[in-house]
Interface confidence: medium
Amino acid sequence: MAVTACQGLGFVVSLIGIAGIIAATCMDQWSTQDLYNNPVTAVFNYQGLWRSCVRESSGFTECRGYFTLLGLPAMLQAVRALMIVGIVLGAIGLLVSIFALKCIRIGSMEDSAKANMTLTSGIMFIVSGLCAIAGVSVFANMLVTNFWMSTANMYTGMGGMVQTVQTRYTFGAALFVGWVAGGLTLIGGVMMCIACRGLAPEETNYKAVSYHASGHSVAYKPGGFKASTGFGSNTKNKKIYDGGARTEDEVQSYPSKHDYV
């Protein structure tokens, strides 16, 4: 039950995280005009990964896409790449994790297969989250660098008579969305990896099977399950993991965490 909950929660947290990464990538407010030195500006500038926008005092907002690919800063291209890689990995991870969910039955899929898929999706979520966090952090670092550079030469003018205020940019909402979303995806991935440990059997080749015949107990040591000849009401097939043959009375009848639900 705990495994299912951990896996399910990991999936949901990762889903929210990836949705957040997609939202952050699409948002226009990666950097917003710093109004500290010019709070009375009637024109508000903000920029995203794909376009820059200007909101005017009239309420009119104009956005222009970055229609060049080669003319863009390498850092911006790197951030775009990191975010896209994060989204792609996250999307694949989600797809894999859907099939890995313990609560979903697909044919006669083994627990070991589900465990592997859970681990795979978990790793994908972790890498996806790291990509998003890295992308946002690179952009934030770029902003900080540019902010202090523009502060150094903020006011230029003709003999101090005319002021030209250089527009400075600060952290936009998308950065915080990206950081939180990346963190959630990372946490979701870790949860999936933890769930994988609970799903994986300690040893996958079953050495013995004990079954209760109608009359007396006989232990067999076959390679796998053998059909029983007796069909009494107390007949059970049990998996014995630690080698030796035992009678039915010696085996606990409580369901193991490795039993199929």
Epitope: N38, T41, Q47, S52, V54, S57, S58, G59, V162
Partner: antibody, heavy 119, light 113 residues
Framework: QVQLVQSGAEVKKPGASVKLSCKAS????????MHWVRQRPGQGLEWIGM????????NYNEKFKSKATLTVDKSTSTAYMELSSLRSEDTAVYYC????????????WGQGTTVTVSS | DIVMTQSPSSLSVSVGDRVTMTCKSS????????????LTWYQQKPGQPPKLLIY???TRESGVPDRFSGSGSGTDFTLTISSVQPEDFATYYC?????????FGGGTKLEIK
């Protein structure tokens, strides 16, 4: 078509208050900022402030902050400007304007309201 | 506040003349985000509200004759009427649309010679 119809001329005594109205029609009133501009006799134009009918948020010229109060009534699509503690220098024509350009929607002004402050 | 200075304060011209009036701002009206200058030109005739002619320093409002043109960037702007018509005699105002409070120039009155 878009229309901004302002209230009639007002004659007030010094120290009194006056509330001017600007009724909008022909567009979605709550979507555009409403500006107020003053023009003294034979003088230039002065921006008083603006109000967004949807949120009620305002932006005043510091010079008029203690003089003018901007409000709206969404139900009647009407913008109001109340002028308090009137003095002779407040004698002017007051315009309301829906200023929005840069798209298909142009700039519209009311016909103006003349306020005369005289003892 | 941004101070807008218009010159000349009045101008006497004949119909058909080419007219140029200037407007200077105490601070740049150029927005680096979209490389637009937030300067507006208005025409006002006696007893009428102002009429928008040009915004973003050089973009003509729809319905405004093409004899009106705006130019300039940063702090220096110009309104040109290529061939003055009788209906153009009015007062012209420039306005800072970049920073609160929005401020107007003192106006340039275009008179018949």
């Amino acid at each position: 078509q878009v229309q901004l119809v302002q209230s009639g001329a007002e004659v007030k005594k010094p120290g009194a208050s006056v509330k001017l109205s600007c009724k909008a029609s022909g567009y979605t009133f709550t979507s555009y900022w409403m500006h107020w501009v003053r023009q003294r006799p034979g003088q230039g134009l002065e921006w008083i402030g603006m109000i967004h009918p949807n949120s009620g948020s305002t932006n005043y010229n510091e010079k008029f902050k203690s003089k003018a109060t901007l409000t709206v009534d969404k139900s009647t699509s009407t913008a109001y400007m109340e002028l308090s503690s009137l003095r002779s220098e407040d004698t002017a024509v007051y315009y309301c304007a829906r200023r929005y350009y840069g798209s298909i929607s142009p700039d519209y002004w009311g016909q103006g309201t003349t306020v005369t402050v005289s003892s | 506040d941004i101070v807008m200075t218009q010159s000349p304060s009045s101008l006497s011209v004949s119909v058909g003349d080419r007219v140029t009036m200037t407007c200077k701002s105490s601070q740049s009206l150029l927005n680096s985000g979209n490389q637009k200058n937030y300067l507006t030109w208005y025409q006002q005739k006696p007893g009428q509200p102002p009429k928008l002619l040009i915004y973003w320093a050089s973009t003509r409002e729809s319905g405004v004759p093409d004899r009106f043109s705006g130019s300039g960037s940063g702090t220096d702007f110009t309104l040109t009427i290529s061939s003055v018509q009788p209906e153009d005699f009015a007062t012209y105002y420039c306005q800072n649309d970049y920073s609160y409070p929005f401020t107007f120039g003192g106006g340039t009155k275009l008179e018949i010679k």
